[in-house]
Amino acid sequence: VPRWRQQWSGPGTTKRFPETVLARCVKYTEIHPEMRHVDCQSVWDAFKGAFISKHPCNITEEDYQPLMKLGTQTVPCNKILLWSRIKDLAHQFTQVQRDMFTLEDTLLGYLADDLTWCGEFNTSKINYQSCPDWRKDCSNNPVSVFWKTVSRRFAEAACDVVHVMLNGSRSKIFDKNSTFGSVEVHNLQPEKVQTLEAWVIHGGREDSRDLCQDPTIKELESIISKRNIQFSCKNIYRPDKFLQCVKNPEDSSCTSEI
């Protein structure tokens, strides 16, 4: 008789999850000389230890501490790019502007990007059928707790001017329920961070509105200024041109507003 298995509302663990994590770790440490000392088998063991045999609605930040320790990485604190609901463009940007870093440009962020995982209480099995959904099932699930933990640490490390890329096509350009809005904003350290600069990315070609005046951006400014951090905002009207100008800043068309 097959054993009854908990059915969750979210998709199950990404197929070939252990192999993917291990392969990504090896690839990352090969590309980044400063992380060559990392033992990828130990990283996988620590990752696995955070959620295997544990109830997938009862995961804590402490569960991930061994992994956090192994994945400790120093990125230039004044070169941090946060993003919300516009991951692809943020990643395209840091691929061109190599001295800036999103969370997914760090080892731990790179390992977990776009993956889902969970285990089952009291068994060493990985659940490939379903995993808890943040809204429908529980917030303390392995994936959500992982991203909350690494996002908090990433924000805490930031200094000087921190940039955040926001999606101007969404109804809530700044969403306080996003990881950026609920975790990163509140963990920027006023003693170290002087300014948060928001880049609001426009979607439509003919969209000439000043989205920095959007009520949700005003809300972000309020939250940030109350933390004693300065706030600035720029409209990126032409994201395609923006990226092109990052690649070729000498281009004559790059002096005009983008």
Epitope: K176, P190, T216, K218, E219, S222, I223, S225, K226
Partner: antibody, heavy 125, light 111 residues
Framework: SLEESGGDLVKPGASLTLTCTAS?????????MCWVRQAPGKGLEWIGC????????IYYASWAKGRFTISKTSSTTVTLQMSSLTAADTATYFC???????????????????WGPGTLVTVFS | AYDMTQTPASVEVAVGGTVSIKCQAS??????LSWYQQKPGQPPKLLIY????LAASGVSSRFKGSGSGTEYTLTISGVECADAATYYC????????????FGGGTEVVVK
């Protein structure tokens, strides 16, 4: 509405915890919940605020850091823990909600629109 | 630090008259300033937020807020006996590095 409780007569050096209980709304909509005090015959003095959307965002007046602790203890209660009390802490302590303004609960300073009646703390030797 | 200086500390005004209360911030506060009215034995009542917006339908249009940057003013016109109270300004711009978000208060005495 808001209601403060826990005010008392205490000796110098004592600790005390005040509780603010919300009725008719809860903290699933994000607010800044603030504590303000008023010594007899004096003006309003801001103690600090907690952003109910994130336990990481708690703010204190520079003079209150270390001796005062604000916490969200449930979806309808916020507490103010006070330690090493002195006669200068004798005051009525108010809890206030710094409201959202604009549509869809955007928080960009709507002012403290809801206040409790206050609870009296007297420190005497 | 964000310090709020309120003047005058006390003012006397005749019924029907006009009174102005000033509030100066030590740094720009982006018009995130509120005004409150407090009567003895009561908690404060919000009158104006974001420097110039009336807080609720119950607040008389005789109360007018103005200003920007670091200088703000509350003007009460057509003063009534019921306006006798202490008025406070409060900045909502920064909660970091603040001694007191409130001004010192202005007592309005109505003759």
């Amino acid at each position: 509405s808001l209601e403060e409780s826990g005010g008392d007569l205490v000796k110098p050096g004592a600790s005390l915890t005040l509780t603010c209980t919300a009725s008719g709304f809860d903290f699933t909509t994000y607010y800044y919940m603030c504590w303000v005090r008023q010594a007899p015959g004096k003006g309003l003095e801001w103690i600090g605020c907690i952003y109910t959307g994130s336990s990481d965002s708690i703010y204190y007046a520079s003079w209150a850091k270390g001796r005062f602790t604000i916490s969200k203890t449930s979806s309808t209660t916020v507490t103010l823990q006070m330690s090493s009390l002195t006669a200068a802490d004798t005051a009525t302590y108010f809890c206030a909600r710094d409201r959202p303004s604009g549509n869809d609960d955007y928080i960009y300073d709507g002012g403290m629109d809801l206040w409790g009646p206050g609870t009296l703390v007297t420190v005497f030797s | 630090a964000y310090d709020m200086t309120q003047t005058p500390a006390s003012v006397e005004v005749a019924v029907g008259g006009t009174v102005s209360i000033k509030c100066q911030a030590s740094q720009t506060i982006n018009s995130w300033l509120s005004w409150y009215q407090q009567k003895p034995g009561q908690p404060p009542k919000l009158l104006i937020y974001q420097a110039s917006k009336l807080a609720a339908s119950g607040v008389s249009s005789r109360f007018k807020g103005s200003g920007s940057g670091t200088e703000y003013t509350l003007t009460i016109s057509g003063v009534e006996c019921a306006d006798a109270a202490t008025y406070y300004c409060q900045q909502g711009y920064s909660f970091g590095n603040v001694d007191n978000a409130f001004g010192g208060g202005t007592e309005v005495v109505v003759k």
